[in-house]
Amino acid sequence: MRTEAQVPALQPPEPGLEGAMGHRTLVLPWVLLTLCVTAGTPEVWVQVRMEATELSSFTIRCGFLGSGSISLVTVSWGGPNGAGGTTLAVLHPERGIRQWAPARQARWETQSSISLILEGSGASSPCANTTFCCKFASFPEGSWEACGSLPPSSDPGLSAPPTPAPILRADLAGILGVSGVLLFGCVYLLHLLRRHKHRPAPRLQPSRTSPQAPRARAWAPSQASQAALHVPYATINTSCRPATLDTAHPHGGPSWWASLPTHAAHRPQGPAAWASTPIPARGSFVSVENGLYAQAGERPPHTGPGLTLFPDPRGPRAMEGPLGVR
């Protein structure tokens, strides 16, 4: 998602015109401008592909288009966490990878994308109505989720290119603060720019070196990668029936290494209650005193270590957990 704004070039004031005050007034817009330019909306893309070699095998690939550091990725099926999903894999940059059959191989592809192979044979293939969801928890953006599936008519070996799916949910707790500050900053910046516009030159002029005013642009991947990513999202085509109830809003994900000690009653959801949340179904980041954070949902009182806030500087594969285990 890219937003562009025409912003006239800011020229430093001529010496002596406003002195120190002038400098100070223009440092702030520069800082704010930088913040505005770098503060784009993150996105999650999901790609589901049926393997041509093994017709009952699926590969799910997900990526996060955002500038924050990823602290956790959860892949589930049946719908977004908290709305009918059971966790298939959870990937943590430091603590490794957890996966549940029929997930066969979950791995980090890059620091911001993962892939998961799902196996099945005949009856154990995922269903036609199965949606796969990827949820990325990142700092400071919060938690973002997108879902995808394979088109019913898809040929084996083919897939829709990855796409940011429409089901995107940001964790308010994680982003409201940052967004609020940035929004305020951007508004303030515009206000300053307008004030400068109505003042005599040479406060603000078009850049002499560029025929066109430079563009401030919110964070986005390169246009090439964006083009590759923006396509309709996909779903799975297999041989089992849809759920008989529409009221299913099962679960979130597993309690990771542990969860926050909360004192909620036993949660009503099932198979994947790690990221399960009370309604509204948003994962909510909770900061913990010791600098760790975990996902708190409606769950039994758990205690234990939380999630490490910062991923391993060596990157996601620095430690892939006990996954010599399969």
Partner: antibody, heavy 118, light 107 residues
Framework: EVQLQQSGPELVKPGASVKISCKAS????????IHWLRQSRGKSLEWIGY????????GYNQKFKSKATLTADNSFSTAYMEFRSLTSEDSAVYFC???????????WGQGTSLTVSS | DIQLTQSPASLSVSVGETVTITCRVS??????LVWYHQRQGKSPQLLVY???NLADGVPSRFSGSGSGTQFSLKINSLQSEDFGSYHC?????????FGGGTKLEIK
């Protein structure tokens, strides 16, 4: 109250198949994975696999993938395990259990005793 | 697959005594370990989840400790209903595996 009620004991011949049922009550069936485990006499518990009733998709322990078929019938809130090509090694007590959030099994069936004998 | 080694395999103790059962895991599973109690001819009952959390309705004389690869279950002041088998199980990834079990008998 959450309850898992399993079908009765089975005595079958080697090479035959058996289908054991596990009827759930007291909670929304489609919301929880139902797992199947077995315990041979004097041995530890072994995990066979699970079925996710919401979409009917199972996940298997590779050891049992060619031996077991796990299904669910949401209209009857019942999970099934079919075990085929039975040998005396398959004589055991088979349990179904409800999984809570990839964290633990909080409710178990009473067990179904399977005896494979000629 | 992750291996769980439970010790001791059997234990003969008297009512009122304190016992500790250990479970060693072949890989770091953080706190993803569960303990069950099983009476003869019955199904297992959840005691402890997440390594240290007591399940609903479980008496406080039971306690779980440990994380990573080493876990233990402690039972203070054993009661007659505590006899039977104890199993540890990891919940890290599938395939889920169990320890060999510890049989607790009355002395």
């Amino acid at each position: 109250e959450v309850q898992l009620q399993q079908s009765g004991p089975e005595l079958v011949k080697p090479g035959a198949s058996v289908k054991i049922s596990c009827k759930a009550s007291g909670y929304p069936f489609i919301n929880y994975n139902i797992h199947w485990l077995r315990q041979s006499r004097g041995k530890s518990l072994e995990w066979i696999g699970y079925v996710y009733p919401y979409n009917g998709v199972p996940g298997y322990n590779q050891k049992f993938k060619s031996k077991a078929t796990l299904t669910a019938d949401n209209s009857f809130s019942t999970a099934y395990m079919e075990f085929r090509s039975l040998t005396s090694e398959d004589s055991a007590v088979y349990f179904c259990a409800r999984e809570r959030g990839r964290d633990y099994f909080d409710s178990w069936g009473q067990g179904t005793s399977l005896t494979v004998s000629s | 697959d992750i291996q769980l080694t439970q010790s001791p395999a059997s234990l003969s103790v008297s009512v009122g005594e304190t016992v500790t059962i250990t479970c060693r895991v072949s890989a770091n599973i953080y706190s993803n370990l569960v303990w069950y109690h099983q009476r003869q001819g019955k199904s297992p009952q959840l005691l402890v989840y997440g390594g240290t959390n007591l399940a609903d309705g479980v008496p406080s004389r039971f306690s779980g400790s440990g994380s990573g690869t080493q876990f233990s279950l402690k039972i203070n002041s054993l009661q007659s209903e505590d006899f039977g088998s104890y199993h540890c199980q990891h919940f890290w990834s599938t395939p889920y595996t169990f320890g060999g079990g510890t049989k607790l008998e009355i002395k």
